[in-house]
Interface confidence: low
């Protein structure tokens, strides 16, 4: 049976989803266990004018010992405000001074990355050293890159289309995902339904995916379901500023007592489906629909409490 | 819902202070670039000054007119920006409007009138 | 600084005409933003990034361009179109606006 309930953007103000990913537009990740260096490049694309950007490194220790040399190669397309964070990290940092403005004095070594294109810029770096992990990234607002944590079975880092970059790479797209939402044709009441649809990643591995809601309205006026799909190698903590009735696929647990899983559901793994079963717990209001790539946290923030849906 | 209200405009002589805030709601002010544009009677739209976010160290930036006589300035606890106008001069009159940066000037206030005049 | 120039300052036309405006840059630029104001009013964001529309902004109005030349176009004019756009730039310091170009009814 088809559910009528016609999917429309939510404005911010109604509803902003944010999250955190491994996945990319393009990347690689390589063992180089022997070189002296670890080489990182990252290739960032800024669609819309001046752009601020958190760059965070992060070693972890080895045999009780900082890891060797990083070199950070950073090609930008557009110009940006970094704001790195490297503490105690012997960095070297190739970038286009031109483009590239620190928030504050890096406190680093820096040399100038020559104007190459992409292949010639991996090239450049490979001279330098093994390259331990390439990603080409759009519009990032947010980068974690972890040192010493590459685990990728190539050898020699060449840059596919659509890779995981586990846990060597996070970032935080700066454009938040689509929300949508839409009126239950037929339902009474106003019980609204947040329906998360986590899509398959590149890598099937077991994944936790964080979700933090926060609505923002009093406790008692809300009468809420939140709705989790994803792959069946994902599961779920949930942590939520309300009591709300959880539905989801795999396990899940809540922030407040993590070590208790309760299983989840088969749930249905189209819309449309996923619409139904809104429809069968009553949800009178989508408040919000969201499909995102495999994520490792995800914000929800919606202010629409029941009944009061407003689409852009 | 984004606000922002602007407040502080008013008359003042060639050479005079003036200080102007803008009070926002309805978003994470402390993650937000600001910023201050005016436009003169008739003309068109000017950029004034910016100040950033926390995870930007508040950096602040100004146009060249304005550089060592108007100081833009913030308080995150209050969710209010300011702009203070030194030695201001006849062609600083102009309407000045409050505005977020998020890839565009997404928002902006409904602006304050600073007239310059003896 | 790069010179924002658009053009005509003034354009004269009916409603259900079509109005090109156009915003010529002293040197390349990545994106160009429009915004519209209208008498008494503070500006509104009305396309970002060369050709996207901002929230509410009809679907008569489109954006393009590269390099030094970027164009609003208005399919249509309806009677609340009439207003004066600005366009703006950020792809070098400082941030700079255009003149603006009134669109005034016939």
């Known amino acids: 049976e088809t559910v009528h309930c016609d999917l429309q953007p939510v404005g911010p103000e109604r509803g902003e989803v944010t999250y955190t990913t491994s996945q990319v537009s393009k990347g690689c990740v390589a063992q180089a266990p022997n070189a002296i260096l670890e080489v990182h490049v990252l290739f960032l694309e800024f669609p819309t004018g001046p752009s601020q950007l958190e760059l965070t490194l992060q070693a972890s220790k080895q045999n009780g010992t900082w890891p060797r040399e990083v070199l950070l190669v950073l090609s930008v397309n557009s110009s940006v405000f970094l704001h790195l964070q490297a503490l105690g990290i012997p960095l070297h940092l190739a970038y286009n001074s031109s483009l590239v403005t620190f928030q504050e004095p890096p406190g680093v070594n820096t040399t100038e990355l020559p104007s190459f294109p992409k292949t010639q810029i991996l090239e450049w770096a490979a001279e330098r050293g093994p390259i331990t992990s390439a990603a080409e990234l759009n519009d990032p607002q947010s980068i974690l890159l972890r040192l010493g944590q590459a685990q990728g079975s190539l050898s020699f880092c060449m840059l596919e289309a659509s890779q995981d970059m586990g846990r060597t790479l996070e970032w935080r797209p700066r454009t938040p995902a689509l929300v949508r939402g839409c009126h239950l044709e037929g339902v009474a009441g106003h019980k609204e339904a947040h329906i998360l649809r986590v899509l398959p990643g590149h890598s099937a591995g077991p994944r936790t995916v964080t979700v933090k809601v926060e609505l923002s309205c009093a406790p008692g006026d809300l009468d809420a379901v939140l709705i989790l799909q994803g792959p069946p190698y994902v599961s779920w903590l949930i942590d939520a500023n309300h009591n709300m009735q959880i539905w989801t696929t795999g396990e899940y647990s809540f922030k407040i007592f993590p070590e208790k899983n309760i299983r989840g559901f088969k749930l249905p793994d189209t819309p449309q489906g996923l619409l139904g079963e809104a429809r069968m717990l009553n949800a009178s209001i989508v408040a919000s629909f969201v499909e995102l790539p495999l994520a490792s946290i995800v914000s929800l923030h919606a202010s629409s409490c029941g009944g009061r849906l407003q689409t852009s | 819902e984004v606000q922002l209200v602007e407040s502080g405009g008013g008359l003042v002589q060639p050479g005079g202070s003036l200080k102007l805030s803008c009070a926002a709601s309805?978003?994470?002010?402390?993650?937000?670039?600001m910023d201050w544009v005016r436009q003169a009677s008739g003309k068109g739209l000017e950029w004034v000054a910016e100040?950033?976010?926390?995870?930007?160290?508040?950096?602040?930036y100004y146009a060249e007119s304005v550089k060592g006589r108007f100081t833009i300035s913030r308080d995150d606890s209050k969710n209010t920006v300011y702009l203070q106008m030194n030695s201001l001069k006849t062609e600083d009159t102009a309407v000045y409007y409050c505005?977020?940066?998020?890839?565009?000037?997404?928002?902006w206030g409904q602006g304050t009138l600073v007239t310059v005049s003896s | 600084e790069i010179v924002l120039t658009q053009s005509p300052a003034t354009l004269s036309l009916s409603p259900g005409e079509r109005a090109t405006l156009s915003c010529r840059a002293s040197?390349?630029?990545?994106?160009m933003h429009w915004y519209q104001q209208k008498p008494g009013q503070a500006p509104r964001p009305w396309i970002y990034?060369?050709?996207n529309l901002a929230s509410g902004v009809p679907a008569r109005f489109s954006g393009s361009g590269s390099g030094t030349d970027y164009t609003l176009t208005i399919s249509s004019l309806e009677p609340e179109d009439f207003a004066v756009y600005y366009c703006?730039?950020?792809?070098?310091?400082?941030?700079?606006f255009g003149g603006g170009t009134k669109v005034e009814i016939k």
């Open positions: 505005t977020r940066w998020r890839r565009f000037f997404d928002s």
């Open positions: 309805g978003f994470t002010f402390s993650d937000a670039w």
């Open positions: 100040i950033r976010s926390k995870a930007s160290n508040h950096a602040t």
């Open positions: 040197s390349s630029v990545s994106y």
């Open positions: 990034a060369t050709s």
């Open positions: 703006q730039q950020w792809s070098s310091n400082p941030l700079t």
